[in-house]
């Protein structure tokens, strides 16, 4: 969480951002809130990116003002227009690109003063893993698949029964480049699994951590998945 204070004569206003991550090819949100104003006419929101000459986005006098917008963001940005009046300056970024990563500044002017805060935005790819029993294998085998990751993640297996056990000798992980030549499909196979146990396949890079669990018993198979972004720090 980054909290910024701006000086404007007598007044400064508090602006708060939250570091976040964008999933390439999908829409992302750059979070920014500020002390709300009572009227829209005096609110100015400017989003800037370090190393980029033009603006990422500008909102003033109740509408988008995109004449100074940098070409790389053309047609890809929007604020939540109905939320500006209550202090939400968050930016929706469409079709996130790898090159969108960097340091952004959320700069706010209201009738009460000015303020700004920086935001670190990471980009990559992350997806939920699915763990299945591989019935084609000769022995009891689990297969963990996740369709899109970047940068290349690490994959670690764990088991509820054999806590702390190292499964690297009995597992095999491969990374297959997807058609867009950036993201990769992750496939990890765990051999010699035992029944009545819960296994977890954990995939992690510097952006996200995802876990796929599978519980195999005589009578049923239960699955659960979870994904967590690692760098949601507020400023």
């Amino acid at each position: 969480l980054i909290i910024g204070f701006g000086i404007s004569g007598r007044h400064s206003i508090t602006v708060t951002t939250v570091a976040s991550a964008g999933n390439i090819g999908e829409d992302g949100i750059l979070s920014c809130t500020f002390e709300p104003d009572i009227k829209l006419s005096d609110i100015v929101i400017q989003w800037l990116k370090e190393g980029v000459l033009g603006l990422v986005h500008e909102f003033k006098e109740g509408k988008d003002e995109l004449s100074e917008q940098d070409e790389m963001f053309r047609g890809r940005t929007a604020v939540f227009a109905d939320q500006v009046i209550v202090g939400n300056a968050s930016l929706r970024l469409k079709n996130v690109q790898l090159t969108d990563a960097g340091t952004y500044k959320c700069y706010i002017i209201t009738s009460k003063g000015k303020g700004n805060a920086n935001l670190e935005y990471k980009t990559g790819a992350f997806s939920m893993p699915e763990v299945n029993v591989d019935y084609n294998a000769s022995s009891e085998t689990l297969r963990c698949e996740a369709p899109r990751w970047f940068p290349q993640p690490t994959v670690v297996w764990a088991s509820q029964v054999d806590q702390g056990a190292n499964f690297s000798e009995v597992s095999n992980t491969s990374f297959e480049l997807n058609s867009e030549n950036v993201t990769m499909k992750v496939v990890s196979v765990l051999y010699n699994v035992t029944i009545n146990n819960t296994y977890s396949c954990m995939i992690e890079n510097d952006i996200a951590k995802a876990t796929g669990d599978i519980k195999v018993t005589e009578s049923e198979i239960k699955r659960r998945s979870h994904l967590q972004l690692l760098n949601s720090k507020a400023s």
């Epitope: 002390e35 009572i38 509408k63 009046i85 009460k112």
Partner: antibody, heavy 115, light 107 residues
Amino acid sequence: EVQLVQSGAEVKKPGASVKVSCKASGDTFTTYWMNWVRQAPGQRLEWMGGIYLNRGSSEYNEKFKGRVTLTVDTSASTAYMELSSLRSEDTAVYYCARDSRFSYWGQGTLVTVSS
Amino acid sequence: DIQMTQSPSSLSASVGDRVTITCKASQDVSTAVAWYQQKPGKAPKLLISSASYRYTGVPSRFSGSGSGTDFTFTISSLQPEDIATYYCQQHYNTPLTFGGGTKVEIK
């Protein structure tokens, strides 16, 4: 659930003052504006002013400047509107309304000014 | 001050009818217009903010549109529980101002 509970009805004589309270519950109290709106019988809604609860800074409708005072007691999660030099045309229902979108409203306080 | 002129001041329609209320601002207010519903003896309720955004929990039959000076509020299929007075309001500049209201009745 956010709730704004206002003080009860008041009967005042011309020239007197009235202080209406608005107690908020169910959410962070200080990060919003609290607006005050009145509605005289058969009349349109009329914005009197608003106070930013976190700082106590306020904006007033010029029409009421000098007669209306908005205050806040953050420890009690309560906002106040005081209207002085009352006249008969101030007879109205007075509402508090939270945030710049007026998302939540109090139930209203009837103030009757009569000699 | 920005004047908000609402019309009609009252209307009568049948259940299931499409009802349209207009609001004209005396100067450009961008999309800084909200619509409220007020039932007799009750406080107003926010229905639409920023001209066209339905507030949380508001039925989809209520909608709003417009920008600049001309705004429209629509009930696509009037229901008995929609009997109320509807107000537009601008939050573009202070003093914040409301329209005169439109009283909606059932035929």
